[in-house]
């Protein structure tokens, strides 16, 4: 697994640098999981043929993903620092079902899929602590997620592989576009 | 392999509006990740940046001259255009659209078209 | 807006000389800043990404550093071929900024 954000050989050669701030350590933390859900890609597309498939023909899934829309505030054409910043919150916790979904689905990359998973629930915590309004962050339904998590290992092993694409694809267009938010507040 | 390539009107009127189209080959503008923007350089002036479009629809324009110009994308026509209204004089420069690609945007032109001149 | 300022504006240069441009963001900007050259009557070219990362059939005499908000472009033995303008680009956010250039000229 990578070095977790702040423990990169970089940072030991450099013992004066000045401390990460929380924008800039929210920015490291994206860019390490980034980096895990790239690794876990790999895998999957050398298992199996899907990464080839078009957008379109992946389109026609039944799992609601979090993606970002311009209603959520973090595009440049109404952008609301807040509004984006609950939303983005909400979207992380949404794909934490599907997180762990990926738990057991990869033969070498296991350590990785658990690392993306961890680093995930520090992520949200460093932007809790940025929030201001914690109350207009809704949490999922555990037993919605458990009945969700039955269903999605209860698939047969094309739609499972099927689904593990779409789910790295779609959290990595959601953490691309929150990293690039996060930067304009 | 990647390449752009700006087209458009050489000469405009004062007051008239300005239509750039750069067509792309060698990548989609629907992968996560990718953009692409427009730069201007005056002669013998430096760079300056225009605006921006990404994969998902997400439009960035230069703050001085946002009232003037829309940027959108054609996605299955491996277009963008650049529409800038009210021309001026002072708008005389190199137009150039680039590409950006990579997981952390890093916002980087790792390619430039050859530019087309506007005067 | 974060504005680049690059230094010198203009570096009178001997090949094989070993030289150093300066680019200073009005802000700290991480490790989102990028190099490019411009030879005269040519598209700008990406030079260096995100500081030091080196860029494919990019020689590597052309080396970065930094971090912050202060960075440097270093050519470790000037060829002929050198000579043009180099720009830094702020790449954390927008609007994108460019320094005015520094102009490499031989002597």
């Known amino acids: 697994a990578p070095v977790p954000p702040g423990e990169d050989s970089k940072d030991v050669a450099a013992p004066h640098r000045q401390p990460l701030t929380s924008s800039e350590r929210i920015d490291k933390q994206i860019r390490y999981i980034l980096d895990g859900i790239s690794a876990l890609r790999k895998e999957t597309c050398n298992k199996s043929n899907m990464c080839e498939s078009s957008k379109e023909a992946l389109a026609e899934n039944n799992l609601n993903l979090p993606k970002m829309a311009e209603k959520d505030g973090c595009f440049q054409s109404g952008f609301n620092e807040e509004t984006c910043l609950v939303k983005i919150i909400t979207g992380l916790l949404e794909f934490e079902v599907y997180l762990e979904y990926l738990q057991n689905r990869f033969e070498s990359s296991e350590e990785q899929a658990r690392a993306v998973q961890m680093s995930t629930k520090v992520l949200i915590q460093f932007l809790q602590k940025k929030a201001k309004n914690l109350d207009a962050i809704t949490t999922p339904d555990p037993t919605t997620n458990a009945s969700l998590l039955t269903k999605l290992q209860a698939q047969n092993q094309w739609l499972q592989d099927m689904t593990t694409h779409l789910i790295l694809r779609s959290f990595k267009e959601f953490l691309q576009s929150s990293l690039r938010a996060l930067r304009q507040m | 392999q990647v390449t752009l390539k700006e087209s458009g009107p050489t000469l405009v009127k004062p007051t008239q509006t300005l239509t750039l189209t750069c067509s792309f080959s060698?990548?989609?503008?629907?992968?996560?990740?990718?953009?692409v923007g427009w730069v201007r350089q005056p002669p013998g002036k430096a760079l300056e940046w225009l605006a921006f479009?990404?994969?998902?629809?997400?439009?960035y324009y230069s703050p001085s001259l946002e009232s003037r110009l829309t940027i959108t994308k054609d996605t299955s026509k491996n277009q963008v255009v650049l529409t800038m209204t009210n021309m001026d004089p002072v708008d005389t420069a190199t137009y150039y659209c680039?590409?950006?690609?990579?997981?952390?945007?890093?916002?980087?032109?790792?390619?430039w078209g050859q530019g087309t001149l506007v005067t | 807006d974060i504005v680049m300022t690059q230094s010198p504006a203009t570096l009178s240069v001997t090949p094989g000389d070993r030289v150093s441009l300066s680019c200073r963001a009005s802000?700290?900007?991480?490790?989102?800043l990028h190099w490019y050259q411009q030879k005269s009557h040519e598209s700008p070219r990406l030079l260096i990404k995100?500081?030091?990362q080196s860029i494919s059939g990019i020689p590597s005499r052309f080396s970065g550093s930094g971090s912050g908000s202060d960075f440097t472009l270093s050519i470790n033995s000037v060829e002929p071929e050198d000579v043009g303008v180099y720009y830094c680009?702020?790449?954390?956010?927008?609007?994108?900024?460019f320094g005015a250039g520094t102009k490499l000229e031989l002597k």
């Open positions: 060698g990548f989609s503008l629907s992968t996560s990740g990718v953009g």
């Open positions: 995100s500081v030091s």
């Open positions: 680009q702020n790449g954390h956010s927008f609007p994108l900024t």
């Open positions: 680039a590409r950006s690609y990579d997981d952390y945007l890093y916002y980087a032109l790792d390619y």
């Open positions: 802000q700290s900007i991480s490790d989102y």
């Open positions: 479009i990404f994969w998902d629809d997400d439009k």
